[in-house]
């Protein structure tokens, strides 16, 4: 392990389309990948009229967008489907939306998901 970096070995797993994709619905996913590459966790969700609907959560392969992020935060302004990634075991249990806007002050919308 590299000092100061969170190694990701497992992530919270959730799949809203578990029947169609023939997977489990919820659980803990062990993260596999090439031995020298970094591993991350991710979360994707939709905001339907203020109601949070989780799409998927799981492991994500080596991605510089996720390096050294201990929290799962979507920064893109108003995406259709929200996506965030992070490093550290189960770091995708909580996720939030914190858009990077140039003029207006960003607002944080932390979410503690409760999968159905």
């Amino acid at each position: 392990a590299i000092l100061g970096r969170s190694e990701t070995q497992e992530c919270l797993f959730f799949n809203a389309n578990w029947e169609r994709d023939r997977t489990n619905q919820t659980g803990v996913e062990p993260c596999y990948g090439d031995k020298d590459k970094r591993r991350h966790c991710f979360a994707t969700w939709k905001n339907i009229s203020g109601s949070i609907e989780i799409v998927k959560q799981g492991c994500w392969l080596d991605d510089i967008n996720c390096y050294d992020r201990t929290d799962c935060i979507e920064k893109k302004d108003s995406p259709e489907v929200y996506f965030c990634c992070c490093e550290g075991n189960m770091c995708n249990e909580k996720f939030s939306y914190f858009p990077e806007m140039e003029v207006t002050q960003p607002t944080s919308n932390p979410v503690t998901p409760k999968p159905p």
Partner: antibody
Framework: QVQLVQSGAEVRKPGSSVKVSCKAS????????INWVRQAPGQGLEWMGT????????SYAQKFQGRVTITADTSTSTAYMELSSLRSEDTAVYYC????????WGQGTLVTVSS | QSALTQPRSVSGSPGQSVTISCTGT?????????VNWYQQHPGKAPKLMIY???KRESGVPDRFSGSKSGNTASLTISGLQAEDEADYYC???????????FGGGTKLTVL
């Protein structure tokens, strides 16, 4: 082992469209990006665009904006690249590649545009 | 999204070292450690050799190494072997907020 298997060669007329598929196996399809790259005969590699299969979010090279559409079907672990308004200069081998680092590549699909 | 600049060709004798350069801008090559190197033999798909500027892909011999200074990345192949004769491309990580771009390619001839 990780494999990306692409659809077979295509011949198209100028002005038409082509859709190339890329079926992934040996890893979790929703755990990384799929990128598309093309290579014209005797030429270099050209990045076309990328998709995040889990969110459906895409980014396209400026050159192809408006002409290329990249999609992904998570139920079949397959990514697609559709290029429209084809011209002879689009004759090339089209590759899909896994992840931001392009660590695994498909075998390539030759698309020939000819009248 | 302009293509990165590589020399068209380089050559070397077996056992020698060669270096291939890849020059870009502060927003691609100079931005973080985004540069990768690919080897392509005729009629074959490209193969990732070096990623993140200097990390060797699994299974790649340690004769291949990568480095970066400012907006120029370099691939060095030491102890040249006949099978190293191929086209080499530099490229950048693509995904999320990053767009991809490749160099024009360098033909390596082993004399």
């Amino acid at each position: 082992q990780v494999q990306l298997v692409q659809s077979g060669a295509e011949v198209r007329k100028p002005g038409s469209s082509v859709k190339v598929s890329c079926k992934a196996s040996g890893y979790t399809f929703t755990s990384s990006y799929i990128n598309w790259v093309r290579q014209a005969p005797g030429q270099g590699l050209e990045w076309m665009g990328t998709i995040n299969p889990v969110s459906g979010s895409t980014s396209y090279a400026q050159k192809f904006q408006g002409r290329v559409t990249i999609t992904a079907d998570t139920s079949t672990s397959t990514a697609y690249m559709e290029l429209s308004s084809l011209r002879s200069e689009d004759t090339a081998v089209y590759y899909c590649a896994r992840g931001g680092w392009f660590d695994y590549w498909g075998q390539g699909t030759l698309v020939t545009v000819s009248s | 999204q302009s293509a990165l600049t590589q020399p068209r060709s380089v050559s070397g004798s077996p056992g020698q070292s060669v270096t291939i350069s890849c020059t870009g801008t502060s927003s691609d090559v100079g931005s973080y450690n985004r540069v990768n190197w690919y080897q392509q033999h005729p009629g074959k798909a490209p193969k990732l050799m070096i990623y993140g500027v200097s990390k060797r892909e699994s299974g790649v011999p340690d004769r291949f190494s990568g480095s970066k200074s400012g907006n120029t990345a370099s691939l060095t192949i030491s102890g040249l072997q006949a099978e190293d004769e191929a086209d080499y491309y530099c490229g950048t990580f693509a995904g999320g907020r990053y767009y991809g771009v490749f160099g024009g390619g360098t033909k390596l001839t082993v004399l």
